[in-house]
């Protein structure tokens, strides 16, 4: 805490400029008017204040705005934003996308900090949903942002926002998240033709059910192995050898290299060896000829 001392003669700050970096902490406290600072916040970003000096400037703003800073100040915080705690940010009401962008720019190139996470949370809650412009902005700064949300939070993403999602934005999503996003993507891209539709939906297919995979197999899509390996195991298991062959097209040869990994391994175990042999890939582990396959899950449902 900085002691209250009188400002030395001739040192009263008339504007926020570089002369202030030569002030000691107590001089900054005594000679800089908080209201002046608030109106000239945009200048701070260009001036190399030390961390100690920034603490004083933050303290002055905190005293001026004990209930939280107004958006006119927040938008121009610049690198003083790095001094804010999540508790400070929870007092803010950030409604402008420009303000959000300005603060994300300050943190650019770094991992998402607790401050940024709180800021985004406040902003999205204020808007009520993750609209396309917000999602565009957030994924531009943090490609993994979408996958950091819970399935519940993702449910508030409108299908129209899905157009903003790039394949790399989904790299770290788990199946539960893709289960929520896939139906939205299907809805968003429903009016596209076959090949264009597949290009757009491909990254979301980790949430696709069996019937959609069967439908895709009829469209000559040539799914690559990387996409196939991310499909839900329970969605892949009911597919026939012929359907998988059509789904993968020329990439079907890649199954051999993945035969020990899920979902390929589990799928092989469900297929007749005769059918697997038709692929000519030497896949082993299918059901031997003459064996009867009982679907116990179906039997349990009937009893």
């Amino acid at each position: 805490e900085v002691e209250k001392t009188a400002c030395p003669s001739g040192k009263k700050a008339r504007e926020i400029d570089e002369s202030l970096i030569f002030y000691k902490k107590w001089e900054l406290e005594a000679c800089v008017d908080a209201a002046l600072l608030a109106t000239q916040m945009d200048r701070v970003n260009a001036i190399p204040f030390t961390y100690e000096q920034l603490d004083v400037l933050k303290h002055k703003l905190d005293e001026l705005y004990p209930q939280g800073y107004p958006e006119s100040v927040i938008q121009h915080l610049g690198y003083l934003f790095l001094k804010m705690s999540p508790e400070d940010i929870r007092k803010w009401n950030v409604t402008s996308l420009e303000t959000l962008k300005a603060l994300l720019e300050v943190n650019k190139g770094h991992e998402m900090s607790p401050q940024v996470a709180t800021l985004i949370d406040r902003f999205v809650k204020g808007r009520g949903q993750l609209d396309k412009d917000t999602l565009d902005t957030l994924t531009a700064f943090y490609p993994g942002y979408l996958c950091s949300l819970s399935p519940e939070e993702l449910s508030s993403v409108p299908p129209s926002s899905i157009w903003a999602v790039r394949p790399q934005d989904l790299d770290t999503c788990d199946p539960r998240q893709l289960d929520v996003l896939y139906p939205k993507a299907r809805l968003a891209f429903q009016n596209m033709n076959g090949s264009e539709y597949f290009v757009k939906i491909q990254s979301f297919l980790g949430g696709a059910p069996t019937e959609d995979l069967k439908a895709l197999s009829q469209q000559n899509v040539s799914m690559d192995l990387a996409t196939f390996m991310k499909l839900r195991t329970d969605a892949v298991l009911p597919l026939t050898v012929a359907e998988v062959q059509k789904l993968l097209g020329p990439h079907v040869e890649g199954l051999k290299a993945e035969e020990r990994h899920r979902p390929v391994r589990d799928w092989i175990l469900r297929q007749r060896q005769d059918d697997l042999d038709t692929l000519g890939l030497g896949l082993q582990g299918g059901i031997p000829n003459g064996y009867l396959v009982l679907d116990l899950s179906m039997q349990e449902a009937l009893s």
Epitope: E18, I21, N45, A46, I47, P48, G78, Y79, L82, V106
Partner: nanobody, 112 residues
Framework: QVQLVESGGGLVQPGGSLRLSCAAS????????MAWFRQAPGKGLEAVAS????????IYADSVKGRFTISRDNSKNTLYLQMNSLRAEDTAVYYC?????WGQGTQVTVSS
């Protein structure tokens, strides 16, 4: 992003001279105030000199006025600090800064 790299520090006798350089890369510096700071052993950071890249305004700390000169070379995107009549109390790590960006520092030792 802006990267700042200082050089030119070293050991010098009292009364001697040194010229520090700070090479900047990344973003253009026109919108920033650039400055030299120093930190003596066991002390806090102290601003030594500043230059407003757009207006050209120069400011010096009282302790170095008349001895140190800050300058810049726009074509090389480089900031300089010419230090003359060095004293033992000038011994410190010298840092170059531009807005929120800081260099790693260069050691200056004034000793006989």
């Amino acid at each position: 992003q802006v990267q700042l790299v200082e050089s030119g520090g070293g050991l010098v006798q009292p009364g001697g001279s040194l010229r520090l350089s700070c090479a900047a890369s990344g973003r253009t510096l026109e919108s920033y105030v650039m400055a030299w700071f120093r930190q003596a052993p066991g002390k806090g950071l102290e601003a030594v000199a500043s230059i407003n890249w757009s207006s050209g305004r120069l400011i010096y700390a009282d302790s170095v006025k008349g001895r140190f000169t800050i300058s810049r070379d726009n074509s090389k995107n480089t900031l300089y600090l010419q230090m003359n009549s060095l004293r033992a109390e000038d011994t410190a790590v010298y840092y170059c800064a531009a807005g929120r960006y800081w260099g790693q520092g260069t050691q200056v030792t004034v000793s006989s």
